[in-house]
């Protein structure tokens, strides 16, 4: 048995299969066919005119504890010659996701649902030109 300190408000760790249940459900939701998954590109981050890097965002008190997040490499976009185009901006595309956060200082198996904004990639947009009136 997991020797987790119990309190009156904590569910019993031995009887609680919460983590396993969540894992099973997420596997079903995330399951992609091999065909679809193999087509998913991993090199867009380098080939894009607004390239980005990925960092491994870790939070042990979050489920999932590992989320890969994008950050734009440049403020500007890269043109065909590989130079930065000062008329075009790189902007981060963000997606709102739901995560489970462990209740701090409480039970290891007690979580709350939270929204999280995650960067998934970058795109190129034209700079806003403000004309002097």
């Amino acid at each position: 048995a997991v020797l987790i300190p119990q309190s009156s408000v904590c569910p019993n760790a031995e009887a609680n299969n919460f983590l396993q249940n969540v894992k099973v459900n997420l596997k079903v939701i995330n399951s992609l066919s091999s065909k679809a998954s193999s087509r998913r590109p991993s090199d867009y981050l380098n080939r894009s005119t607004s390239p980005w890097t990925l960092s491994r965002n870790e939070d042990p008190d979050r489920y999932p504890s590992v989320i890969w997040e994008a950050q734009c490499r440049h403020q500007r976009c890269v043109n065909a010659e590989g130079k930065l185009d000062h008329h075009m901006n790189s902007v981060l595309i963000q997606q709102e996701i739901l995560v489970l956060k462990r209740e701090p200082e409480k039970c290891p198996f007690t979580f709350r649902v939270e929204k999280m904004l995650v960067g998934v990639g970058c795109t190129c947009v034209s700079s806003i030109v403000r004309h002097a009136s």
Epitope: V2, K23, S38, R40, L45, L54, S55, P60, P64, W68
Partner: antibody, heavy 119, light 107 residues
């Protein structure tokens, strides 16, 4: 059946580079992280870094950040670990291991690749 | 980085007896600890994940317990094939770290 098959043993001179491969089969290569771990003779295990073949993201142990490069080739379902500026203390068995990101554990390991650095 | 300290370094036990291996983390790692078995010339083999969950195909004589900083791997009745080196590992935060190992030898 999930399998991780690594390249063969290497002998390198100090200052040289080595590139170890790890070919995955039996599952969708882009779905899980690949971690690299090394074990010096008679020693414990040391984490080098991680690559996610699905998105190309990498993260490194600070001790290896300047010398290790992790890459992945989706067309061949192969992950690579390159270590440069080799020194004698890099002599070790290098393992690739699959990490289940949601579940949070290493389940399958390659058979290991012995890299010997000697002048 | 989080340091994982295993004790004892070597444990001598007779077949059929119980073995208790200890692992301490330098800071709390919740239940994000795994235990691995390694035999000479072989890769590590996962036994326990999340401190107390037995991995698929692992015999019931292996059990894990603990949370926070103190963790234990127990082998209830040692079989000849159980004599090996055992490592604990934390994946609470990177860099992920391993204990130095406990060598379980036949008494």
């Amino acid at each position: 059946e999930v399998q991780l098959v690594q390249s063969g043993a290497e002998v390198k001179k100090p200052g040289a580079s080595v590139k170890v491969s790890c070919k995955a089969s039996g599952y969708t290569f882009t779905d899980y992280e690949f971690h690299w771990v090394r074990q010096a003779p008679g020693q414990g295990l040391e984490w080098i870094g991680v690559i996610h073949p699905g998105n190309g993201g990498t993260a490194y142990n600070q001790n290896f950040r300047d010398r290790a490069t992790l890459t992945a080739d989706k067309s061949t379902s192969t992950a690579y670990m390159e270590l440069s500026s080799l020194r004698s203390e890099d002599t070790a068995v290098y393992y690739c291991t699959r990490f289940l990101t949601y579940e949070g554990y290493f389940d399958y390991w390659g058979q290991g690749t012995l890299v010997t650095v000697s002048s | 980085e989080i340091v994982m300290t295993q004790s004892p370094a070597t444990l001598s036990v007779s077949p059929g007896e119980r073995a208790t291996l200890s692992c301490k983390a330098s800071q709390s790692v919740s239940i994000d600890v795994g235990w691995f078995q390694q035999k000479p010339g072989q890769s590590p083999r996962l036994l326990i994940y999340h401190a107390s969950n037995r991995y698929t195909g692992v015999p019931a004589r292996f059990s894990g317990s603990g949370s926070g900083t103190d963790f234990t791997l127990t082998i209830s009745s040692l079989q000849p094939e159980d004599f090996a080196v055992y490592f604990c590992q934390q994946d609470y935060s990177s860099p992920y770290t391993f204990g130095q190992g406990t060598k379980l030898e036949i008494k």
